[in-house]
Interface confidence: low
């Protein structure tokens, strides 16, 4: 359905509050370095313009596309060339090339200072003084640091952020009420950002066929009672929503997401028995709830898959008639029977099945050729099962911090060329899989672990793409989306790597170590550990453990000393010398 004015259409559909929030997010994700006040000014100008179009859709410029309107607005920023360099060249292009150009300049690792949380009283005063500005600042700060954050979901986070302050700034103990809520929002926000980044990478690097396959598998696990046609409809709609959001079309994305939530709630009976409690909630909460809904129970009477996909003489005929539909049905049928498998494993099985049919349907006796295809899935299934088992055992044995350290060593040996901050960030997040997944029952471990690892490894791929340093990382990231994790798992010590020269400065520490939070201390120690492995890639576990134990003892000793800085100055060189000797 075409509208005379797209901007008026979206303003009316979304309402002023959501419209303004989404435009602010869009601008902040594109121009990540611009000051808050500049963005607020631009958003207000766009909003005033939208209102004139609502009043008269035939008014001047109201017929322009949203990309044209928003792009023209972004290109009015006076300091574009000084602040963004070559991104300013985007403004010389016409749509749609201009928007593509802006998208290509989104920075996954912007050079922005870490967000510092002010005192609770300071935050509560700011909240009460100007609630609207306070919440806009939240949207702006999150969006510019996470340029692919799922915009309608960010509005939901902002609503929760507002609710936390509204409740806790009235409480007797404001800090006890507020801080845990803010910690939870921060952690959930980082996780949400990383999950969305994988969806966008899947669409942008591997195409919508890859995303649709992922969605078929995931939705079939969630809605095993739904018919294939119903799942296909949801997949088509979901793909449109995420394509729009990943492409910077945030108003369309939010609007279509609301339509999808409405459709799901109107058709619960043919989708899932678990949707009811979501559908009673207001829009933002409803969409979030539907996205996170637990798997419905599997129908009790599902027949064996073998009849249709192995034993039938019509397999090749059905495959030839509509390859993607037949493979989609196979994936749907397999996924709805296996909530205990990771989505990535299900996609590997579908790929394997496709490869077998491609080969066997050209053979003299196709049926004989593909008769044992399900047996051949076994190694693909066992590989992630064994990986989860081994790593959960290691996690239970070591605890989270030491498990992270084991992964730091493992991944630094695999890809020592990768920057130390990236190795620390990625390995720490890989290590969080233990606490997140290992406590779950057996049937939930693999989907939790492998699909979480896919999200974390995508972060490595995204950061590495910005500054490529390792052919191995490029290969694992680009060859196959579904085999990324097995590809990284298969990497061993990089024998070609020339060890990094020892730099005493890297291992020089000061009294500021003592005032760091526990997490910050861990990051410092883990940074040192990565540097040690880069210096001595063939160091044994025992050698590295010895050095790290010495490090902990050295820091503890100096932090207890009266003159801490003098202690670090005196003990530091001793620690360095002892470490070099231990690793010789």
């Amino acid at each position: 359905d075409t509208h005379k004015s797209e901007v008026a259409h979206r303003f009316k559909d979304l309402g002023e509050e959501h419209f303004k929030g989404l435009v602010l997010v869009a601008f902040s994700q594109y121009l990540q370095q611009c000051p808050f006040e500049e963005h607020v000014k631009l958003v207000n100008e766009v909003t005033e313009f939208a209102k004139t179009c609502v009043a008269d859709e035939s008014a001047e410029n109201c017929d322009k596309s949203l990309h044209t309107l928003f792009g023209d607005k972004l290109c009015t920023v006076a300091t574009l060339r000084e602040t963004y360099g070559e991104m300013a060249d985007c403004c010389a292009k016409q749509e749609p090339e201009r928007n593509e150009c802006f998208l290509q300049h989104k920075d996954d690792n912007p050079n922005l200072p870490p967000l510092v949380r002010p005192e609770v009283d300071v935050m509560c005063t700011a909240f009460h003084d100007n609630e609207a500005t306070f919440l806009k600042k939240y949207l702006y700060e999150v969006a510019r640091r996470h340029p692919y954050f799922y915009a309608p979901e960010l509005l939901f986070f902002a609503a929760r952020y507002k609710a936390a302050f509204a409740e806790c700034c009235q409480a007797a103990d404001k800090a006890a009420c507020l801080l845990p809520k803010l910690d939870e929002l921060r952690d959930e926000g980082k996780a949400s950002s990383a999950k969305q980044r994988l969806k966008c990478a899947s669409l942008q690097k591997f195409g919508d066929r890859a995303f649709k396959a992922w969605a078929v598998a995931r939705l079939s696990q969630k809605f095993p009672k739904a018919e294939f046609a119903e799942v296909s409809k949801l997949v088509t709609d979901l793909t449109k929503v995420h394509t729009e959001c990943c492409h910077g079309d945030l108003l369309e994305c939010a609007d279509d997401r609301a339509d999808l939530a409405k459709y799901m709630c109107e058709n619960q009976d043919s989708i899932s028995s678990k949707l009811k409690e979501c559908c009673d909630k207001p829009l933002l909460e409803k969409s979030h709830c539907l996205a996170e809904v637990e798997n419905d129970e599997m129908p009790a009477d599902l027949p064996s898959l073998a009849a249709d996909y192995v034993e039938s003489k019509d397999v090749c005929k059905n495959y030839a008639e509509a390859k993607d539909v037949f493979l989609g049905m196979f994936l749907y049928e397999y996924a709805r029977r296996h909530p205990d498998y990771s989505v990535m494993l299900l996609l590997r099985l579908a790929k394997a099945y496709e490869a077998t049919l491609e080969k066997c349907c050209a053979a003299a006796d196709p049926h004989e050729c593909y008769a044992k295809v399900f047996d051949e899935f076994q190694p693909l299934v066992e590989e992630p099962q064994n990986l989860v088992k081994q790593n959960c055992e290691l996690f239970e044995q070591l605890g989270e911090y030491k498990f992270q350290n084991a992964l730091l060593v493992r991944y630094t040996k695999k890809v020592p060329q990768v920057s130390t901050p990236t190795l620390v960030e990625v390995s720490r997040n890989l290590g969080k899989v233990g606490a997140k997944c290992c406590k779950l029952p057996e049937a939930k471990r693999m989907p939790c672990a492998e699909d979480y690892l896919s999200v974390v490894l995508n972060r490595l791929c995204v950061l590495h793409e910005k500054t490529p340093v390792s052919e191995k990382v490029t290969k694992c990231c680009t060859e196959s989306l579904v085999n990324r994790r097995p590809c990284f798992s298969a990497l061993e010590l990089d024998e070609a790597y020339v060890p990094k020269a020892f730099n005493a400065e890297t291992f020089t520490f000061h009294a500021d170590m003592c005032t760091l939070s526990e997490k910050e201390k861990q990051v410092k120690k883990q940074t040192a550990l990565v540097e040690l492995v880069k210096h001595k890639p063939k160091a044994t576990k025992e050698q590295l453990k010895g050095v790290m134990d010495n490090f902990a003892a050295f820091v503890e000793k100096c932090c207890k000393a009266d003159d801490k800085e003098a202690c670090f100055a005196e003990e530091g060189p001793k620690f360095v010398a002892a470490s070099q000797a231990a690793l010789a």
Partner: nanobody
């Protein structure tokens, strides 16, 4: 029963060529990376070449680069190692091995092994 069977070995003069085959039975090679290894008398088994399950990724030991070529024909469930410009130091028993999806850089990373085929380069 899962089996890998090497063939194509033999006696060849320096500068000559051989084509080794690794045929799988009991499972489909589509889902496996295949590595070729060799072991000379009194020496460690060493990696020669490997091809990932997709066929898109191959790697070679420095000592054979430019002389050996690995390829696969999934329709025949077979992987080949074309060996040209053979040298006496290529003399060894050649083994093929399979690992799920991706090449490994260590011997213990492989799940299935063949029995080996002898290659002798001598004048």
């Amino acid at each position: 029963e899962v089996q890998l069977l090497e063939s194509g070995g033999g006696l060849v003069q320096p500068g000559g060529s051989l084509r080794l085959s690794c045929a799988a039975s009991g499972f489909t090679l589509d889902y496996y990376a295949i590595g070729w290894f060799r072991q000379a008398p009194g020496k460690e088994r060493e990696g020669v070449s490997c091809i990932a399950s997709s066929g898109g990724s191959t790697n070679y030991a420095d000592s054979v680069k430019g002389r050996f070529t690995i390829s696969r024909d999934n329709s025949k469930n077979t992987v080949y190692l074309q060996m040209n410009s053979l040298k006496p130091e290529d003399t060894a028993v050649y083994y093929c091995a399979a690992a799920v999806l991706e090449c490994r850089t260590v011997v213990r990373g492989y799940d299935y092994w063949g029995q080996g085929t002898q290659v002798t380069v001598s004048s």
